[in-house]
Interface confidence: low
């Protein structure tokens, strides 16, 4: 079927459309082109013989129409007037005519809109404006943006006048924005300038900064305010109700108690002829004195005296802070506040009560803090220490003590040997000892200030010859793969070898076995039951030697998987069942049965005589040993035979 | 028709107490071991530990011995089991179950108590 | 504790089909292997008792076998309702203990 396809459809003022055939007929004699929807020779456009390829002119051609051999027709430099219908008339050689019609619309170019408004300066919550988008133009769509977005739903806000017309009804200030409209049609799309729209609004109520409302006497006054207006506002300054400049910030030096007072802020806008004003009072203190500790007692004794310390001066309605050791004060039954905080009383003082201790005085403004106090609080002596630790020593040797007791003041230190003063010094020594300086040695620590005396006595053994030792244990019963046992030779003596048997063997190389302590220490980690042996110290010198007596190391091991005898599986009816249950376990392990998951006896040896089929069924041994905690079991299924079977025996 | 039915649900926060309960029908209640087992979200299932009901002996878990006491009630036919000391990982599905073939077979179980620990 | 080791630990498959699940045990348990089924309700049963025992009322799809420290549940032809999750447990030794479970899922 022959078609008419117009390329544009929409066609711009100025432009070009191309009236494009389709399906156009074989054996052709010509054709002609009519403006309209009908073949009517008066508007007749063009007509063409395909024999001559002769284009002959109608009464409806502009001069701007150009006809293809294909039939198609161009029409250039379109007008307004040439939107419409056209109809193509074909006429085939056999004279049969066929006809088609197109169409096309033609639009004008749209020029740049502008935006009027009808008040350019709207107050807020007062005004509404009205912008409508300029020129006026038939057939084109209007469209609104706002901050390049398309407008909010609001319902202040308001389209008119086929959308040309944008109204803001109860203007605010988030209004203030960047309006801008679109004019659209078929063939072209323009987009205004950006008109802002200035919202006159304010003043808010000022805000005066800083916020505190605090000063001591001396300081520097600066305030500042400012209140969100349009345009911006003016200020004035009112203090106590007097005027004082028109500035947005006022500056007082060197302030007194008497510029105490209500500060006012008042903020004006012209254009919206509004006045807004904040008060804040303003409060001058005098500096207040710097706080400072007395205490009723200076040289405490430990666990005997109080000591009160007072925070001074007193002032009234103040509130006094305390500090220890740069903390507050910790929660403690020895520490005690007066009901007002001034004195904090440290009853029965340890030496760990030295502090530094402050108190502080809070004002309005900060917190005033006095100097550190340092408690000298007298203790000891404690008893004193002796070193070195030594208890035998060869003859011909020096013989060097240390005594030391923490003690404040430091103790003062006496030597007795076997009960004799020998000197008041904190070190004895004594060259080239002999068997005669054998004896009890006694450190006496003396405090002066608080009259306590402590002693410690060590004796002194001086022989070519050593003793025999002896080996002390740190655990008697250890238990197996959990804990370790360390082995200690007594006594310590000087310049002495240490040595160690196991079943009278030396040292076995192990990952487990540890030396320390000069060899005097032999530590076994994780026990094993083999680890049960007899174990001997030894201690020699250049002179002598000798051997402890073993000491056996009992371990607490098991109870193992135990094993059911005898290995039996299947028995005749009538046969006594007698089960022995053996578990390796150090103690003895305890015993007991299950037939069936139903307890039995607590015995090693489950009897039961003349079986049946009923006995049929899973025979559980139970083992538990106290001492380690531990618990272990074994099953066995036992199958009973109807006597006249003979079934074969299974283990 | 043996039944195991046990108590609801529980919330309880760390460091509390929690007793669920296990009451037992269908069967000579005295004459069968009941067990105790718990199932973490996700997770397997963990022996807790058993209690014959005729003279009230027990065995635990190890590791729930400090955690867990399980008692019986043989006038209502009831098992209960005591955790304390309750922490987050605690939480879990406790679930009761007969033993009823020796050798701890687990022939009927009860359908399960769901116990959230959390602050 | 007697470790056990379950594999695999989850499985997809189709009705009709056979499927076999282990359990390797860390030490012999004689036979005291244990077979149990749970639904995602939570509901728990048990299966196969002391190996090969076939709880009465179980289905004959469903089968135990093994010794010594290495066990098998086997379902000769996997029904709808068999879609759930296996356990298999000891009981030789104290404590009772559980292998980790085999999800069977639907293909």
């Known amino acids: 079927k022959l078609t008419i396809e117009s390329t544009p459809f929409n066609v711009a003022e100025g432009k070009e459309v191309l009236l494009l055939v389709h399906n156009l007929p074989q054996h052709l004699f010509g054709y002609s082109w009519y403006k309209g929807e009908r073949v009517d020779g008066n508007r007749q456009i063009i007509g063409y013989v395909i024999g001559t390829q002769q284009a002959t002119p109608g009464p409806a051609y502009s001069g701007r129409e150009i006809i293809y051999p294909n039939a198609s027709l161009l029409i250039q430099n379109i007008i307004q007037n040439d939107t419409g219908f056209y109809t193509l008339h074909v006429i085939k050689s056999d004279l049969v005519n066929e006809e088609a019609t197109g169409q096309f619309r033609v639009y004008p170019e749209l020029p740049k809109p502008s935006i009027s408004s009808n008040n350019s300066k709207p107050v807020e919550d007062k005004d509404a404006v009205a912008f409508t988008c300029e020129p006026e133009t038939q057939d084109a769509t209007y469209l609104w943006w706002v901050n390049n977005q398309s407008l909010p739903v609001s319902p202040r806000l308001q389209l008119s006048n086929g959308n040309r017309t944008l109204t803001l009804f109860n203007v605010t200030r988030n209004d203030t924005a960047s309006y801008k409209c679109e004019t659209q049609n078929p063939v072209s799309a323009r987009r205004s300038d950006s008109v802002i729209l200035n919202v006159l609004y304010g003043p808010d109520a000022p805000t005066i900064s800083p916020l505190n409302t605090s000063y001591r006497s001396g300081e520097n006054l600066n305030l500042s305010c400012h209140a969100a207006s349009n345009p911006p506002a003016q200020y004035s300054w009112f203090v106590n109700g007097t005027f004082q400049q028109s500035t947005q910030e006022l500056f007082i030096p060197n302030i007194t108690v008497n510029n105490s007072g209500s500060y006012t802020c008042q903020a004006h806008n012209s254009d919206t002829g509004l006045n807004r004003t904040t008060v804040t009072t303003i409060t001058v203190y005098a500096e207040p004195p710097k706080p400072f500790i007395t205490s009723n007692n200076s040289n405490p004794v430990e666990d005997e005296d109080a000591v009160a310390l007072t925070c001074e001066p007193e002032i009234q309605n103040t509130t006094y802070l305390w500090w220890v050791n740069n903390q507050s004060l910790p929660v403690s039954p020895r520490l005690q506040l007066s009901n007002d905080n001034r004195t904090l009383t440290l009853l029965s003082v340890t030496r760990n009560d030295v502090g530094p201790y402050e108190c502080g005085i809070q004002n309005e403004l900060s917190v005033d803090h006095s100097d550190p106090v340092i408690l000298n609080v007298l203790y000891g002596p404690d008893d004193p220490t002796i070193s070195p630790s030594y208890t035998y020593y060869r003859p011909g040797v020096n013989l060097s003590l240390s005594c030391h007791a923490a003690s404040n003041p430091p103790a003062q230190y006496s030597w007795l040997i076997d009960g004799n003063i020998q000197q008041h010094t904190q070190e004895l020594f004594i060259s080239n000892i002999t068997e005669k300086n054998s004896g009890l040695y006694t450190c006496q620590a003396n405090n002066s200030a608080s009259g306590h005396s402590r002693t410690t006595v060590k004796t002194i053994t001086v022989s070519a010859e050593l003793p025999k030792p002896s080996i002390s244990s740190n655990n008697s019963k250890p238990v197996e793969d959990k804990d370790a046992v360390a082995f200690t030779c007594e006594p310590e003596a000087q310049n002495t070898t240490y040595l160690w048997w196991v079943n009278g063997q030396s040292l076995p190389v192990s990952p487990r076995l540890q030396l320390s302590n000069g060899n005097r220490t032999l530590t076994l980690f994780n026990v094993t039951r083999n680890d049960a042996r007899a174990y001997v110290c030894g201690i020699q010198n250049s002179v002598s030697a000798n051997r402890s007596d073993p000491v056996t190391l009992d371990v607490l091991y098991g109870p193992d998987t135990p094993i059911i005898s005898p290995p039996d599986s299947s028995y005749l009816s009538g046969a006594n069942l007698n089960l022995s249950c053996h578990s390796a376990s150090n103690p003895s392990p305890q015993y007991s049965w299950r037939i069936n998951g139903i307890p039995q006896q607590h015995t090693q040896v489950l009897f039961i005589a003349k079986i049946t089929p009923n006995n049929n069924g899973t025979y559980a041994c139970f083992v538990s040993n106290l001492a380690t905690g531990r618990n272990n079991s074994i099953v066995k299924s036992i199958t009973v035979s109807a006597s006249g079977t003979s079934p074969g025996l299974s283990a | 028709e043996v039944q195991l039915v046990q108590s609801g649900a529980e919330v309880k926060k760390p460091g509390a107490s929690v007793k669920v309960s296990c009451k037992a029908s269908?069967?000579?209640?005295?004459?069968?071991?009941m067990n105790w087992v718990r199932q973490a979200p996700g997770q397997g299932l963990e022996w807790i530990g058993d209690i014959f009901p005729k003279n009230g002996n027990t065995d635990y878990n190890r590791k729930f011995k400090d955690k867990a006491t399980l008692t019986v009630d043989k006038s209502t036919s009831t098992v209960y089991m005591e955790f304390r000391s309750l922490r987050s990982e605690d939480t879990a599905v406790y679930y009761c179950a007969r033993s009823g073939y020796g050798n701890y077979v687990f022939d009927y179980w009860g359908q399960g108590t769901l116990v959230t620990v959390s602050s | 504790d007697v470790q056990m080791t379950q594999s695999p630990s989850s499985l997809s498959a189709s009705v009709g089909d056979r499927v076999t699940i282990t359990c390797r045990t860390s030490?012999?348990?004689?036979?005291?292997l244990n077979w149990y089924q749970q639904k995602p309700g939570g509901a728990v049963k048990l299966l196969i008792y002391?190996?090969?025992g076939l709880l009465s009322g179980v289905p004959s799809r469903f089968s135990g076998s093994g010794s010594g420290t290495d066990y098998t549940l086997t379902i000769s032809s996997l029904q709808p309702e068999d879609f759930a999750t296996y356990y298999c447990?000891?009981?030789?030794?104290?404590?009772?203990?559980f292998g980790g479970g085999t999800k069977v899922e639907i293909k």
């Open positions: 030490q012999d348990i004689n036979i005291y």
């Open positions: 002391y190996r090969s």
């Open positions: 269908g069967y000579t209640f005295t004459d069968f071991y």
């Open positions: 447990q000891q009981g030789n030794t104290l404590p009772p203990t």
